[in-house]
């Protein structure tokens, strides 16, 4: 049988002869050359010789254990005279020993890692890993051991797991942002003679809101004209804040001063300034100066960082509103004015006022838009507004007169104003009810006495307070001995009755009444209008059939039949 | 004055791509982010992008429907703005404009007269 | 995202009539990112109001803007021919949205 145990064989032997490994050796070998041992498998012929005759083995080259660790052969010793295997084949195993020749490597030659600025010591910030390519179950060649050879006292790391944290309190992002750490990783435990191998980790503090804002200056003044429109950007101011991104946006707030409902605060998107803005309109003449508190506060507050005071600033703002040459500004937005139409020439209406509100106070001179009183039916004093009438008025023709006055400052004729002035002309009883229409009737010659033949209807273009009342009656001159009557209704209408039974066409053909129409106003005003009765034929229903002036194509009368 | 001039629109076969440019001036460039806004034929307003300034490492925004194929990018030496468009699909017909916000870069204050791009096999 | 709701999508009216269009947003909003354009046909858009209620410069005083919170409007107190334009609402938190316009017509 086979006599060997299992081969050992040093890595990385730098002798100058060959390397011996060992002996194949069989019991049957009497040691006088008769059986000759030959080896097969990993390297047999290059890497490893045997000696044929004595079974020695050796290594030709010198072996890496990172490269290959095992090495498996085949072993047959055989009798040289019969050439047949004295023993069975066999395997066997060349294991290569090591030795600690791989210092440690970083998984990465430069790591990147970030913790918060003001982190609390041990806060864990990266774990770095270094691997060893050495035998890990044989001696202490692959035992890595964790070092920091750059980097306090701000770092550790731990010696077993790689594993970097803070080691200094309030590390502050706004006074150091970025810090450099090397890592040392070294074999065989971290002893002497061990191999080490470092790698570098940038480590940057991110930010916390640990700033609050502050103005750099306590007061700010800023000028505006009071022309400006709301909206109106007036000025900026700007809180730092040390902080960055979302910890240094900034919101601005006006807390306190008069301008609180006058003046508004925004904050620039992107430059976080505070933009001062007009929110209503400003007058000069009723206040020059205005004064705020802005305040410019984190709206992203940290709690744990409270205890550092508020995370606010306040600074005044001190606002100045610049005088602007206004136009005269009326009294009324509009002039209601009223004035009876019988006034005579040169009547005063009324009046208007306007100021120049500049502090100034420049004079003002009127005038009428003669665009909108083309007829110069009016007139004002160009030195106290008083409105007069320059011809006769008739309300009859126009009810109402809508016209302009403009007002102009004596020292600057650009700035002028313009107001409406509405006129109202007041009725006067200046003119006759007259008849609504022209009558012509009929009368037939069978009628009765007491029939109503015509109604009459008046008219008046005048306007009484409490409505027309017209009264009806014939001229004096017809009053007596008349066919006919008239019959006052009292409801501004009348009736023409016939007085007698019966009329001859052949005696008279036409009547001609004079109806007097009154009013009941002040002064009584009247007219006398004429009605026209023809005498005609009509049937037995009253129809007319014939009258003697045929000409009469449209009567009026009501029916007189029966 | 504030003016704004886009050019670099075109027709462009899907899947294509093309460079928007727009030239501004009269305003400082560098304080306001700037925008793109298109606007379909016939169709309403929609805003495509939106680059900030460098006080905010010219952080950039996107439409749903053009992320990963626009980039919106900026020069301030130049006072320039482009919109590199690429993988075009046929939606993307549109007048494109470059916009300007008002003052505190709130709204969408001053807009260019527009450059059409359309997108069509 | 925010999306803001317009309405009435298209409407006519007659020169000094009072015309309001209204803008909801789907959650709350600062009434400083809220704005209003006008669109004539052709034209870019031109900003009309700003934060809400304030004028845009050259813009006559016959418009206003009011709202806070989800709901806001533009009003123009008494309609004129040159007013016939489309109408957005837009809001400035990213994404920034628009609404989907309202077309004032002449009737």
């Known amino acids: 049988s086979w006599m060997w145990n299992q081969f050992f064989l040093l890595e990385e032997y730098t002798g100058s002869d060959y390397q011996y490994v060992g002996k194949l050796h069989s019991d049957q070998d009497r040691g006088d050359g008769s059986l000759k041992y030959i080896l097969s498998g990993d390297g047999a012929g290059d890497l490893f010789i045997i000696n044929e005759n004595t079974g020695d083995i050796q290594a030709t080259k010198r072996l890496d254990r990172e490269e290959k660790p095992v090495y498996i052969l085949r072993a047959q010793a055989i009798n040289r005279r019969t050439g047949r295997p004295v023993e069975p084949e066999s395997e066997f195993i060349i294991k290569i020993h090591d030795i600690n020749d791989n210092e440690p490597i970083f998984t990465k030659e430069v790591y990147t890692a970030t913790v918060p600025e003001m982190s609390d010591v041990g806060t864990f910030v990266v774990q770095v890993t270094a691997t060893d390519a050495d035998d890990p179950t044989y001696g202490n060649s692959a035992k890595v051991v964790y070092s920091i050879l750059q980097g306090q006292p701000y770092f550790s790391v731990e010696s077993e797991t790689g594993i970097i944290k803070t080691a200094l309190l309030n590390m502050d992002r706004e006074n150091r942002e970025q810090y450099q750490v090397v890592i040392q990783a070294k074999d065989m435990g971290g002893q002497m003679g061990g191999l080490s191998g470092t790698t570098t980790v940038n480590i940057t503090l991110t930010d916390v809101n640990d700033n609050p804002p502050r103005f750099p200056q306590s007061t700010y003044q800023f000028k505006t004209p009071e022309s400006s429109p709301p909206g109106t950007p007036i000025g900026r101011i700007k809180a730092s804040d040390a902080d960055v991104g979302e910890n240094a946006e900034i919101e601005y707030s006006i807390t306190d001063g008069e301008g609180l409902d006058m003046f508004d605060v925004i904050t620039d998107q992107e430059t976080q300034e505070g933009i001062i803005t007009v929110k209503k309109l400003l007058d000069f003449e009723k206040k020059k100066v205005y004064t705020l508190k802005v305040e410019a506060s984190n709206p992203h507050v940290e709690p744990r960082f409270l205890y550092l005071g508020p995370f606010k600033d306040s600074a005044t703002v001190r606002i100045v509103v610049e005088d602007v040459d206004e136009p005269p500004v009326f009294s009324k937005l509009a002039y209601i004015l009223q004035i009876r139409e019988d006034a005579q020439i040169n009547t005063t209406i009324g009046s208007v006022t306007a100021q120049d509100p500049d502090a100034a106070r420049n004079p003002v001179k009127y005038s009428v838009d003669r665009h909108t009183d083309m007829d110069r039916i009016f007139n004002i004093d160009s030195g106290n507004g008083s409105i007069f009438t320059s011809k006769l008025l008739d309300r009859e023709t126009l009810l109402w007169h809508n016209i302009t006055v403009i007002a102009t400052e004596i020292n600057n004729p650009k700035q002028s104003s313009r107001v409406p002035l509405y006129i109202k002309v007041l009725d006067v009883n200046d003119n006759a009810p007259e008849f609504a229409e022209f009558y012509e009737t009929f009368v037939c010659e069978k009628a009765k006495a007491d029939q109503l033949i015509q109604t009459l209807r008046a008219v008046d273009k005048d306007d009484p307070y409490s409505g027309h009342q017209f009264s009806f009656s014939l001229a004096p001159e017809a009053a007596s001995g008349s066919n006919f009557t008239i019959q006052d209704n009292k409801d501004n209408t009348a009736g023409i009755l016939t007085r007698k039974n019966g009329y001859n066409r052949h005696e008279m053909s036409t009547y001609l009444l004079p109806v007097v129409i009154s009013d009941n106003d002040y002064p009584v005003q009247s007219s006398t209008g004429t009605v026209t009765v023809r005498v005609c034929a009509c049937d037995h229903h009253g129809n007319m059939q014939s009258c003697h002036a045929e000409a009469l194509i449209h009567p009026t009368g009501l029916s007189t039949g029966a | 004055e504030v003016h704004l001039v886009e050019s670099g629109g075109g027709l462009v076969q899907p899947k294509g791509s093309l460079k928007l440019s727009c030239v501004a001036s009269g305003f400082t460039f560098t304080t306001y982010a700037m925008n793109w806004v298109r606007q379909a034929p016939g169709k309403g307003l929609e805003w495509v992008a939106r680059i900030r300034i460098k006080n905010n490492n010219y952080a950039t925004y996107y439409a749903d429907s053009v992320t990963d194929r626009f980039t919106i990018s900026r020069d301030d030496s130049q006072s320039m703005l482009y919109l590199q468009m690429n993988n075009l699909k046929t939606e993307d017909t549109a007048m494109y404009y470059c916009?300007?916000?008002?003052?505190?870069?709130?709204?969408?204050?001053?807009w260019g007269q527009g450059t059409l791009v359309t997108v069509s096999a | 995202e925010i999306v803001l709701t317009q309405s009435p999508t298209t409407m006519a009216a007659s020169p000094g009539e009072k015309i309001t269009i209204t803008c909801s947003a789907s959650?709350?909003?600062?009434?400083?990112?809220l704005h209003w354009y006008q669109q004539k046909p052709g034209f870019s858009p031109k900003l009309l109001i700003y934060r809400s209620f304030y004028l845009a410069s050259g813009v006559p005083l016959r418009f206003t803007g009011s709202g806070s919170g989800t709901s806001y409007s533009l009003t123009i107190g008494t309609m004129e021919a040159e007013d016939v334009a489309t109408y957005y609402c837009q809001q400035d938190i990213v994404p920034l949205t628009f609404g989907a316009g309202t077309k004032l017509e002449l009737k």
């Open positions: 916009v300007r916000p008002d003052y505190g870069n709130y709204g969408l204050a001053y």
């Open positions: 959650s709350s909003i600062s009434s400083h990112y």
